[in-house]
């Protein structure tokens, strides 16, 4: 059974993941130039189901494409440093989902834009945090 301290640690990691994802979405939403239009042409795979921490495998598998799209956004008005940001997210995701069990991610048939993708994973974090509190 999870201890109080392990639950607190999980909650803090989820909060960090949530904030990082919100930061990306905010940075993208602040865009008012042709780069945004180009960013929205990239398609991301969405999880068929995302209700448990093990489903973060589906996010982990999309982190490389996410970094590539964010690299497009680099400018003096985009302060997110994709390499550092994705590296931070990757560390959190690995800790949260654990490496003991191998989970094969199942993806939905429809792909999504970066905005839809981020909103989906933000909602995932928020729903898990809500169950923990």
């Amino acid at each position: 059974a999870p201890t109080s301290s392990s639950t607190k640690k999980t909650q803090l990691q989820l909060e960090h993941l949530l904030l990082d994802l919100q930061m990306i979405l905010n940075g993208i939403n602040n865009y008012k130039n042709p780069k945004l239009t180009r960013m929205l042409t990239f398609k991301f795979y969405m999880p068929k189901k995302a209700t448990e921490l093990k489903h973060l495998q589906c996010l982990e598998e999309e982190l490389k494409p996410l970094e590539e799209v964010l690299n497009l956004a680099q400018s003096k008005n985009f302060h997110l440093r994709p390499r550092d940001l994705i590296s931070n997210i990757n560390v959190i995701v690995l800790e949260l989902k654990g490496s003991e069990t191998t989970f094969m991610c199942e993806y939905a048939d429809e792909t999504a834009t970066i905005v839809e993708f981020l909103n989906r994973w933000i909602t995932f974090c928020q729903s898990i945090i809500s169950t923990l509190t």
Epitope: L19, Q22, M23, H79, Q126
Partner: antibody, heavy 113, light 107 residues
Framework: QVQLVQSGAEVKKPGASVKVSCKAS????????MHWVRQAPGQGLEWMGI????????TYAQKFQGRVTMTRDTSTSTVYMELSSLRSEDTAVYYC??????WGQGTLVTVSS | DIQMTQSPSSLSASVGDRVTITCRAS??????LAWYQQKPGKAPKLLIY???TLESGVPSRFSGSGSGTDFTLTISSLQPEDFATYYC?????????FGQGTKVEIK
């Protein structure tokens, strides 16, 4: 006792820049993301942006995009908020807030010619 | 951006009164709402987070409720130290946004 201590009041001329510091003590510096919120005299609270103290990356409210820069120095557990091209409407108290639950005492920035 | 609208903008009440402040979001924010108290010349103080969870050290006369778009802060029995300005705040999506504030004054 977790504490955020901000730098002192500043008076600036229009067009200048100001850099406000916020030093954290009493908890792991990288544990909570740092927000900056400002409050003009007699007005409400306005969110400016957030920085991840571990990674050093930040995102800002669209209103401040291009004028604000948030940075951090992990060796001194300090975050900074720099606002450039100051105008009279930027006269406000600027707060740092760790996770939005621990707040600094505020720094009054007055912009006047 | 998500707009937060508080009502009333000010109210007069007496010690011992039950006070209710409402906050409405322009879209659903689930339960991602916090309430702050601010006294003149001081930094805001967190009272309630996640709609209804009392921050450590906050008296139990403060309570929060609601979900989706409509939220309420209730002070069950107003005390002299409760005269202040109260703000709601959403963290469902960035940018973080605050209500315009409700000033609670002595009648």
């Amino acid at each position: 006792q977790v504490q955020l201590v901000q730098s002192g009041a500043e008076v600036k001329k229009p067009g200048a820049s100001v850099k406000v510091s916020c030093k954290a003590s009493g908890h792991t510096f990288t544990r909570y993301y740092m927000h900056w919120v400002r409050q003009a005299p007699g007005q409400g609270l306005e969110w400016m942006g957030i920085i991840n103290p571990s990674g050093g990356y930040a995102t800002y409210a669209q209103k401040f995009q291009g004028r604000v820069t948030m940075t951090r120095d992990t060796s001194t557990s300090t975050v900074y908020m720099e606002l450039s091209s100051l105008r009279s409407e930027d006269t406000a108290v600027y707060y740092c807030a760790s996770g939005l639950f621990i707040w600094g005492q505020g720094t009054l920035v007055t912009v006047s010619s | 951006d998500i707009q937060m609208t508080q009502s009333p903008s000010s109210l007069s009440a007496s010690v011992g009164d039950r006070v209710t402040i409402t906050c409405r979001a322009s879209q659903s924010i689930n339960s991602w709402l916090a309430w702050y108290q601010q006294k003149p010349g001081k930094a805001p103080k967190l009272l309630i987070y996640a709609t209804s969870t009392l921050e450590s050290g906050v008296p139990s006369r403060f309570s929060g409720s609601g979900s989706g778009t409509d939220f309420t802060l209730t002070i069950s029995s107003l005390q002299p130290e409760d005269f202040a300005t109260y703000y709601c705040q959403q963290s469902y999506r960035f940018p973080v946004t605050f209500g315009q504030g409700t000033k609670v004054e002595i009648k």
